[in-house]
Amino acid sequence: EAHKSEIAHRYNDLGEQHFKGLVLIAFSQYLQKCSYDEHAKLVQEVTDFAKTCVADESAANCDKSLHTLFGDKLCAIPNLRENYGELADCCTKQEPERNECFLQHKDDNPSLPPFERPEAEAMCTSFKENPTTFMGHYLHEVARRHPYFYAPELLYYAEQYNEILTQCCAEADKESCLTPKLDGVKEKALVSSVRQRMKCSSMQKFGERAFKAWAVARLSQTFPNADFAEITKLATDLTKVNKECCHGDLLECADDRAELAKYMCENQATISSKLQTCCDKPLLKKAHCLSEVEHDTMPADLPAIAADFVEDQEVCKNYAEAKDVFLGTFLYEYSRRHPDYSVSLLLRLAKKYEATLEKCCAEANPPACYGTVLAEFQPLVEEPKNLVKTNCDLYEKLGEYGFQNAILVRYTQKAPQVSTPTLVEAARNLGRVGTKCCTLPEDQRLPCVEDYLSAILNRVCLLHEKTPVSEHVTKCCSGSLVERRPCFSALTVDETYVPKEFKAETFTFHSDICTLPEKEKQIKKQTALAELVKHKPKATAEQLKTVMDDFAQFLDTCCKAADKDTCFSTEGPNLVTRCKDALA
């Protein structure tokens, strides 16, 4: 229904705390370089204005759209052109073009320093002094680094953060209470970020139909007892929510997400038997819980998929009458039977089924033509299954760091033109799939592995799009989202690449490496490994292992030495010589 004042409506629906949080996220995601204080000032102004509209919906400007109100605020920021360059040109446009212009200027890789966590005592002091400001800083810092972060979910993570601090700051040993808990939240939030970015990429490049197909498959796996009409309704609503968040309509997105959670909890009987524990929680926890609820038990009496989609004499007639509905039904039926498949795989199978019907229904004897379609799915299913087995075996053998290194070598060989920091980031993220997925029960591994890899590769594509350097990467990133992972997996050594010349300074290290945290040490070593592969793309695994073992030994020796600087300056050149010889 239409409201006289959109801003008053959203303020009333969301309440002041969530309203302010979402407006802060919106501003931080649009203007990623502004300080917290600048954004906090704007948020307060917008909130004060919203309150005047709540008091009187007919007050001046209360009838304006949210994008007009927010955009006018952003465009009034001083020195916009000096700080943001051509983004300032957006302010010459009118709504809704101005908003979409802002959206297109979001930077997936902003040049901001890593978000450093203060030490426990300092953190607890500032949290106790002003919890609201502390959480505001958290929202701002995460949102500006992750401009597509799912806003209502970021509120959930802020709430988690708040609860952890409340609990741990009362403990004697704050550090050992905070560190593992906050590390856990950080890891989950980073995964949430890449997953949501993939959803927005899907909407941006392939539109609503592609996203809705993803939603149908995912929801059908989770709620196999819900009928097709119910799944379609949920998929439509979920598509709307995600579209709003990806489009920067964060207040509408959060409001509609709350509505969807409410609907699901009021209709558990027709959706799933597993929702009750989620539905007992408060709003943010409820919505989060529903988004990752365990799969319902599959109905015991499901007929074979072939009955309606291969053996039925009316297949081509049903397909011709309503293609989208027929294919949607196929995707629903196949997905509810296969919670053990990844969504990407299910969408590839649906695509294969569609291509088969397109071809066969134009022939003289369609049933003879499409009769073998399910058998033709086999290679499509085997490929990711083999991928999971091979990679989980390797992970179990090497551990996370070794597995990351194996992936780093593989991907540097596939796309040696890509910048070393991007390759290292990608390999570290791809390598985490082992820890995340390989320890799961067999039937959960494939969906975990492939859908996570797809999200990470989406980020690789986004970063590469900014500065395209590799034809291999361009080829894989240009196709459909569901074909990306198989495309990257199939890439081999790039034969067109001219190896980088050996530069001694790339492999020269100093004693400061000894005091770095373990993660930073790993990144330094992985940077060297990528550079080695760029120098010798066809180096064998054995050669690379020899060099890296030597390198690790060198670091260990020099970091334990009484005179570290002398050790690094004398032993370093020897290491470089040995590396060159080993790779010759």
Epitope: E100, Q204, K205, G207, E208
Partner: nanobody, 125 residues
Framework: EVQLVESGGGLVQPGGSLRLSCAAS????????MGWFRQAPGKEREFVSA????????YYADSVKGRFTISRDNSKNTLYLQMNSLRAEDTAVYYC??????????????????WGQGTLVTVSS
């Protein structure tokens, strides 16, 4: 393949009305978003209005909100733009466009794969 043919343009006085039509032939289906853009001489092509074929949701540029109305007739596969209270600054060539995927950014011309040839609207006394 989709073909789009606009009609209904012409000369009208300020304050007057016009109704543009866009006949779509070929395989338009429920996932389509249809839109109207315009281009005045020496200016960039700008977004005017759009509608989702599936749910009928509409979008307007601020400059035409309250004066223009977009609508569709599914049975005739036709898109309309009712333009009231026309102003001199509405003078432009009006184009009908179709995005078969309903991509996220509906004001971006590059997201529309199919275009009509355009119809000229002149608002002058």
């Amino acid at each position: 393949e989709v073909q789009l043919v606009e009609s209904g343009g012409g000369l009208v006085q300020p304050g007057g009305s016009l109704r543009l039509s866009c006949a779509a032939s070929g395989s338009t289906d429920s996932a389509y978003r249809m839109g109207w853009f315009r281009q005045a001489p020496g200016k960039e092509r700008e977004f005017v209005s759009a509608i989702n074929w599936s749910d009928g949701r509409t979008y307007y540029a601020d400059s035409v909100k309250g004066r223009f109305t977009i609508s569709r007739d599914n049975s005739k596969n036709t898109l309309y733009l009712q333009m009231n209270s026309l102003r001199a600054e509405d003078t432009a060539v009006y184009y009908c466009a179709a995005d078969p995927d309903s991509r996220l950014y509906y004001t971006v011309p590059q997201n529309y794969d199919y275009w009509g040839q355009g119809t000229l609207v002149t608002v002058s006394s």
